[in-house]
């Protein structure tokens, strides 16, 4: 049998049959169905949608579909006591107030339960004080403010523009700088593409549009009250003071009309350089405080949101494997949205729905995958990846023994320019081979493969003739599977041609204007990009679940390990004197990577030569491949981040969305020149090199001949 041929049935039921069954029209229909009302986590509407999906997945033919519920900490605005920000004069009178809600889009004026813009998990508070503009509130922005400009944010309210990094990192940075409140806003420079109209006439953000989002710093913990364990009916919950990752200062988001009113009065220091200026007609002065005429005016925040333990529901569907039912390939994406979820998440949920339908059709015709496929509709992703994390905590023992791969399925589109893939190196060859077999949906690439259009539009910076594949970071439901459990993971979506704004999202992200019409009118009228993403995600799942030998190439890990070792070594070599003084050597890491390379090469040769008709040897080789990702897990986790346990990859400590390689070494080296005790700091670098070298060597040995 060919590797993608189905199990125990006639050859017509192969990958092609699965892909041919996927229909753009169905994805469109499902998206419409999922986006007519809000599906905020913890609400009745989202519970009803969970039950609908459960029912439909059963109809599609899955063997079983269950709801898995958890009681987790969520956050909501106070319905009778709205959140807002004001400018107050010296008498304390409010002379300007920010808007209490977004103007609803046409056709949605009478929809109830649209949650107003808020920063989820903000504590309550009414701080008042002078404003300091902190650009994107990145680590380097605060370095610029504090070290170069000598501006002290202590006791100030900071205003930061959305974009570049995860909003939770912005809030953490502001807290560490001593701020007493944070205002987040969307600047047109980041959320208004030139030459495009604002919604409803185009896909740009209108001035009254606001990005919602959580501001936690969970570092992979899941429910803040039950870190490490499922939030089930007998859970022990921490007190709110001991909860993981909650912000300590009030935070609130606003649109650029309101931001204009705050920023136009700013005085104090001029912006340090052009990179601190957005596109509003304001000076982008840093402050602190307002300029001359307005210097007695202050900014006051009014935040009354509450944190509540609330029930959430995952939908878990099972398609049992015919040959290896104890090996799980998981396709998961979230269902909860901030409002309508036109892109996030329902463009992804609609694709998952169609993938389930296609698999179900094949199953009804007598087919089964070789391995078990689990389908998941996660809840409360927007509140900190809670549904996926709680389920993984509850099932961790099964997952760590049986988990082959996890494919994420949040938003299918964030643009319509080209494919974007982030995955473990183990999946590089799978992605390459699959995209070579799929047709490109791009204009100008008719009759060409997806691989060709993708490589042309998004070439790898390192490897000639290959497309860019990025490292996995976080900010989505793969986190627990990859960063905590070490299950090979990947994600794919269509993206924009906007490399400089990689982490800013699309303009209407998390706003009320993220509707079905946004997608149908402006992003993908024919749903051809959605169909392509369904083919990529579904094709990956099909091949992972059905190929006789797992489609993982360990040699690709060897290539990136050497690249990452070079990168971290070059960072360290910016301090040659200290490396000499403290006897810092990377030889152990280089040696471990070389050993990994040689062993991976030999393993690959054995993989090509072994007798695939011997089920014991086949299972043994597949287990070595499955457990390779697991071998990069350090049970002790990273320093101060116990749930980030992958030694090769972790979310950046400065931006949760971005992946960092050799994160333990990277963090130990970061800003090392400013450490008060250099001997201790360089000692930690040496320890992290040791941990990394040991882990790479240990992983290599899992690929050695077993006896």
């Amino acid at each position: 049998k060919s590797s993608n041929e189905a199990t125990n049935i006639t050859p017509k039921h192969n990958m092609k049959a699965f892909l041919d069954e996927l229909k753009a029209e169905n994805i469109k229909k499902f998206l419409y169905n999922f986006t007519q009302i809000p599906h905020l986590a913890g609400t009745e509407q989202n519970f009803q949608l969970a039950k609908q999906i459960q029912s439909q997945w059963k109809e599609f033919g899955l063997d079983s579909v269950e709801l898995a519920h958890y009681d987790v900490l969520l956050s909501y605005p106070n319905k009778t006591h709205p959140n807002y920000i004001s400018i107050i004069n010296e008498d304390g009178n409010e002379i300007f107030n920010t808007s209490l809600f977004e103007p609803p889009p046409p056709g949605y004026e009478n929809v109830s339960d649209i949650v107003p813009p808020f920063s989820a998990f903000s504590p309550q508070g009414m701080p008042e004080g002078d404003l300091v503009y902190v650009n994107y509130a990145r680590t380097e922005d605060f370095f610029k403010l504090e070290r170069d400009m000598k501006i002290n944010c202590s006791g100030k309210i900071v205003i930061a523009r959305y974009g570049k990094v995860f909003r939770g990192n912005k809030v953490k940075n502001a807290q560490l700088a001593g701020a007493k409140g944070v205002i987040l806003y969307s600047d047109p420079a980041d959320y208004f593409a030139p030459g495009v109209k604002s919604y409803p006439d185009g896909w740009n953000l209108p001035g009254g549009g606001v990005q919602r989002g959580n501001i936690l710093n969970l570092n992979g913990a899941g429910d803040p009250l039950t870190p490490g364990y499922p939030a089930n009916e007998y859970a022990y919950r921490r007190g709110i003071a001991e909860a993981v990752g909650l912000p300590s200062i009030p935070v609130h988001p606003i649109g650029y009309y309101d931001a204009q009113k705050l920023l136009e009065k700013m005085g104090g220091s001029a912006p340090p350089d052009s990179s601190w200026r957005g596109s509003l007609k304001v000076p982008y002065n840093v402050g602190p405080g307002f300029t001359g005429n307005f210097s007695t005016q202050k900014v006051k925040m009014h935040i009354h949101s509450t944190n509540e333990v609330t029930r959430i529901y995952n939908v878990i569907g099972t398609l049992r494997g015919a040959v290896e039912p104890d090996r799980y390939v998981i396709l998961g994406g979230h269902r909860d949205s901030w409002v309508f979820g036109g892109i996030d998440p329902q463009s992804g949920a609609a694709v998952v729905h169609e993938i389930v339908r296609s698999f179900g059709t094949l199953k009804k015709e007598g087919w089964r995958p070789r391995r078990t496929i689990l389908f998941a509709s996660w809840d409360a992703e927007e509140f900190g990846l809670l549904g996926s994390t709680e389920w993984a905590e509850e099932n961790s023992r099964l997952l760590q023994e049986r988990g082959v791969a996890y494919i994420n399925a949040d938003s299918s589109i964030e643009g319509n320019y080209t494919l974007r893939v982030d995955c473990t190196p183990l999946m590089y060859s799978l992605v390459h081979n699959l995209t070579k077999e799929l047709k490109s949906p791009d204009e100008g690439f008719e009759g060409k493969s997806l691989y060709e259009s993708w490589t042309k539009k998004s070439p790898s910076p390192e490897f000639s003739g290959m497309p860019r594949i990025s490292k996995l970071g976080s900010g989505n439901d793969f986190e627990v599977f990859f960063q905590r459990l070490g299950i090979a993971s990947g994600r794919a979506r269509y993206t924009k041609n906007w490399e400089t704004n990689k982490f800013s999202g699309y303009p209407l992200y998390h706003s009320v204007y993220e509707t079905y019409e946004l997608v149908e009118k402006f992003y993908d009228p024919m749903f051809k990009y959605h169909l392509t993403v369904a083919q990529v995600r579904g094709g990956m799942v099909f091949e992972l679940a059905n190929s006789i030998v797992l489609p993982f190439d360990c040699r690709d890990y060897a290539v990136v390990l050497r690249k990452y070792a070079d990168k971290i070594y070059s960072i360290s070599m910016k301090h040659p004197q200290e490396m000499k003084t403290y006897s810092v050597s990377f030889d152990s890491l280089f040696s471990a990577v070389k050993n990994f390379t040689e062993i991976a090469s030999k393993f690959s040769e054995r993989l090509q030569d072994f007798d695939k008709s011997n089920p014991i040897v086949l299972r043994m080789m597949n287990d070595q491949l499955m457990f390779l990702e697991r071998a990069f897990i350090d049970p002790l986790g990273l320093p101060d981040r116990p749930f980030y346990r992958h030694v090769i990859y972790a979310p950046s400590s400065h931006n949760k969305y971005a992946g960092e390689s050799f994160p333990g070494i990277y963090d130990a080296l970061f800003d090392i020149e400013s450490k008060v005790d250099p001997s201790k700091a360089w000692g930690e670098v040496k320890r992290q090199i040791y941990v990394a070298a040991f882990t790479v060597q240990a992983a290599a040995e899992t690929l050695s001949e077993v006896a």
Epitope: S429, Y569, S570, L589, S591, T597
Partner: antibody, heavy 122, light 111 residues
Framework: EVQLVESGGGLVKPGGSLRLSCAAS????????MNWVRQAPGKGLEWVSS????????YYADSVKGRFTISRDSAKNSLYLQMNSLRAEDTAVYYC???????????????WGQGTTVTVSS | SSELTQPPSVSGAPGQRVTISCAGS?????????VHWYQQLPGTAPKLLIY???NRLSGVPERFSGSKSGTSASLAITGLQAEDGADYYC???????????FGTGTKVTVL
């Protein structure tokens, strides 16, 4: 016997093209990284390009990037170098060489062909 | 321009010991990349002598040995023989260039 035999060299005008071939025998060609290395008259060795066993990792020297294309056909046990926009400074003996493993950055080149001469001149 | 520097020539009488140095940088030899040594007799293709810093290819006489330390490497020929007269090249990988790098080459003359 392990052997590499280059062919396709010759005299070409500046701006012209040539395609070099390298026929491999005596080893499992599909398992090894392969390279092109050149040597200008009276000069030292200069690495030109490298391709791994499954043609996914391809590298070029900066001096030939965008002009030369390396490829391989494992079914034919052959390595190729398509050279376009040739310049006078590309004049050299071109060697095909096998790497000891599938990772060009670790291993030495243990098998070399006899070389084929490329002369770029008007 | 090569990233690995070798002396243009070394010479010695038969039976003598000669060493050829190969000076690299922190992005090649100093970054843990192996050094390999090649011998090129006049009018012939290069031949691998030493791989992985210190390992002799089978069939290479024991009088050839390699070593590596820090950002440099060296090839020693003990008991020099007439047939050792040739050009010798070191080779490594440079991570900043993402490419193989050869040394400038050393001509060994047997007096």
């Amino acid at each position: 016997e392990v052997q590499l035999v280059e062919s396709g060299g010759g005299l070409v005008k500046p701006g012209g093209s040539l395609r070099l071939s390298c026929a491999a025998s005596g080893f499992t060609f599909s398992r090894y990284n392969m390279n092109w290395v050149r040597q200008a008259p009276g000069k030292g060795l200069e690495w030109v390009s490298s391709i791994n066993s499954n043609s996914r990792y391809i590298y070029y020297a900066d001096s030939v990037k965008g002009r030369f294309t390396i490829s391989r056909d494992s079914a034919k046990n052959s390595l190729y170098l398509q050279m376009n926009s040739l310049r006078a400074e590309d004049t050299a003996v071109y060697y095909c060489a096998k790497t000891m493993g599938d990772y060009y950055y670790y291993y030495g080149m243990d098998v070399w062909g006899q070389g084929t001469t490329v002369t770029v001149s008007s | 321009s090569s990233e690995l520097t070798q002396p243009p020539s070394v010479s010695g009488a038969p039976g003598q010991r000669v060493t050829i140095s190969c000076a690299g940088s922190l992005s090649n030899i100093g970054a843990g990349y192996d050094v390999h040594w090649y011998q090129q007799l006049p009018g012939t293709a290069p031949k691998l002598l030493i791989y992985g810093n210190i390992n002799r290819l089978s069939g290479v006489p024991e009088r050839f040995s390699g070593s590596k330390s820090g950002t440099s490497a060296s090839l020693a020929i003990t008991g020099l023989q007439a047939e050792d007269g040739a050009d010798y090249y070191c080779q490594s990988y440079d991570s900043s260039l993402s490419s193989y790098v050869f040394g400038t080459g050393t001509k060994v003359t047997v007096l």
